[in-house]
């Protein structure tokens, strides 16, 4: 796996230990809390990082995720079960035994059920919204700016390709990206549009995940933007199976 | 095998406008990768124009960027530049180059085609 | 932009000597660092990307290392077919997508 030969880290992951004991004396990078090898050349699995970020001490700051999700992400930081490629598990379980379906970005798509609960395949989740607030600033930004670079930022530092990024919408103070990827889209080393967009999620709550990279600092023609507010909707290839009294609840 | 030729004219007038084509074989031009230009002065380095990837919007070398367009005929599996307004300066080779990964390294290039900017 | 400075310009080999060739860049690239060689008259061809990933079809005597900032491509045992100018580039950032000035590898 590739990590920085000269100081031995992962500059995608600094939720790693690294040392060099790989091939030839290579760096090797594993996730913490999993032990799993990582690829440091890319992004590493929302799954791993949540098992990671569960994983570290109790006292560390932990912001939980807004409850405001469309395909409602009000569980928040859970422990999950990684399969051996670091994706979720389609079933998921608590210590209680309490267990739910996931999809693609570990999102609970079900009711909770018992240990009987079956969830046949991860479901993935083809289309993400990126909803954001941008702080005031003394006029709107020009829309095609401000697109070119989100856009930018999405290909170089989440190296997302972008034919995956549908849109960007905006309407002072609401930005909204749209990332796009069918199964049969994603080829082998494609990132992965959830992963991207929590990367990006804890790199515009100042969590950024990067080793050692400063923070995101987002301009538009030199004008920052700061994000006050972030929101995510998944929407999953195959829709989520809730019960109608959670639906009218 | 992947195959780039590049076509066009070899001498261009100051102030004028440099059109040169390139034909992909082996290859589609809608395939997941980007497709560049890269130019090389005589005697000099390389330098990128700028690249297309069909669906997208072209991205351009800032320092290039108001004179410079680049476009794809999916039909024809070819892709084009113009360069507008040159000068002597922009005597070059223009190759045009396959661009491999999210953001390009080239693992394919056309030959080569010498333009000359002179009245 | 990101600036790429390779050194030496030029270099004096014989056959079967061992050359290193070094790039840095003027900021991070990660591992985004492609390396190439160019023959007179003739196009680039791509011998390592990814910093340390060799090509397909590349003789194993082509070897990339480094990250960050600094790399270095070795050639480690000279054949006559070497002779060329060597290029590197990053593609970390595509506003613009930047080469070294290039090193020249001459016979001694």
């Known amino acids: 796996h590739t990590a920085a030969q000269d100081n031995c880290t992962c500059p995608t992951n600094k939720m790693t230990v690294c040392s060099p004991d790989g091939p030839g004396g290579r760096c090797q990078c594993r996730a913490l809390g999993s032990g799993v090898a990582v690829d440091c050349s890319t992004l590493t699995s929302e799954c791993l990082l949540l098992k990671a970020r569960m994983s570290a001490p109790k006292n560390a700051r932990t912001l939980v995720r807004p409850n405001e999700h469309a395909l409602v992400d009000n569980d928040g930081l859970y422990d999950p079960d990684c399969d051996p490629e670091g994706r979720f598990k389609a079933r998921q379980c608590n210590q209680t035994s309490v267990c739910w379906c996931v999809n693609s970005v570990g999102v609970r798509r079900t009711d909770k059920g018992d240990l009987s609960l079956r969830c046949d395949e991860l479901v993935r989740t083809h289309h993400i919204l990126i909803d954001l607030r941008h702080r005031p600033t003394a006029g709107a930004f020009n829309h095609s700016d401000l697109d070119a670079e989100l856009r930018r930022l999405f290909r170089e530092r989440y190296r997302l390709h972008p034919k995956f990024v549908a849109a960007v919408h905006y309407e002072q103070p609401t930005i909204q990206i749209e990332l796009r990827q069918n199964t049969s889209q994603k080829a082998a080393g494609d990132v992965d549009i959830g992963d991207a967009a929590y990367y990006f999620e804890r790199d515009v709550k100042g969590e950024s995940l990067f080793q050692g990279r400063g923070g995101l600092d987002l301009r538009v023609r030199g004008e920052p933007l700061q994000v006050e507010r972030t929101l995510i909707y998944y929407l999953d290839e195959i829709p989520p199976k809730f019960s109608m009294k959670r639906l009218t609840a | 095998q992947v195959q780039l030729q590049e076509s066009g004219p070899g001498l261009v007038k100051p102030s004028g406008t440099l059109s040169l084509t390139c034909a992909v074989s082996g290859d589609s031009i809608s395939s997941n990768n980007w497709w560049s230009w890269v130019r090389q002065p005589p005697g000099k380095g390389l330098e990128w124009i700028g690249e297309?990837?069909?669906?997208?919007?072209?991205n351009y070398n800032p320092s290039l960027k108001s004179r410079v367009t680049i476009s794809v005929d999916k039909s024809k599996n070819q892709f084009s530049l113009k360069l507008n307004s040159v000068t002597a300066a922009d005597t070059a080779v223009y190759y045009c180059a396959r661009g491999s990964g999210v953001i390009s390294y080239f693992d394919y290039w056309g030959q080569g085609t010498l333009v000359t900017v002179s009245s | 932009d990101i600036q790429m400075t390779q050194s030496p310009s030029t270099l004096s080999a014989s056959v079967g000597d061992r050359v290193t060739i070094t790039c840095r860049a003027s900021q991070s690239i990660g591992h985004w660092l492609a390396w190439y060689q160019q023959k007179p008259g003739k196009a680039p061809k791509l011998l390592i990307y990814k910093a340390s990933s060799l090509e397909s079809g590349v003789p194993s005597r082509f070897r990339g290392s480094g990250s960050g900032t600094e790399f270095t491509l070795t050639i480690s045992s000279l054949q006559p077919d070497d002779f060329a100018t060597y290029y590197c580039?990053?593609?970390?950032?595509?506003?613009?997508?930047?080469f070294g000035q290039g090193s020249r590898l001459e016979i001694k």
């Open positions: 580039q990053q593609y970390s950032s595509y506003s613009p997508i930047t």
């Open positions: 297309i990837y069909p669906g997208g919007n072209p």
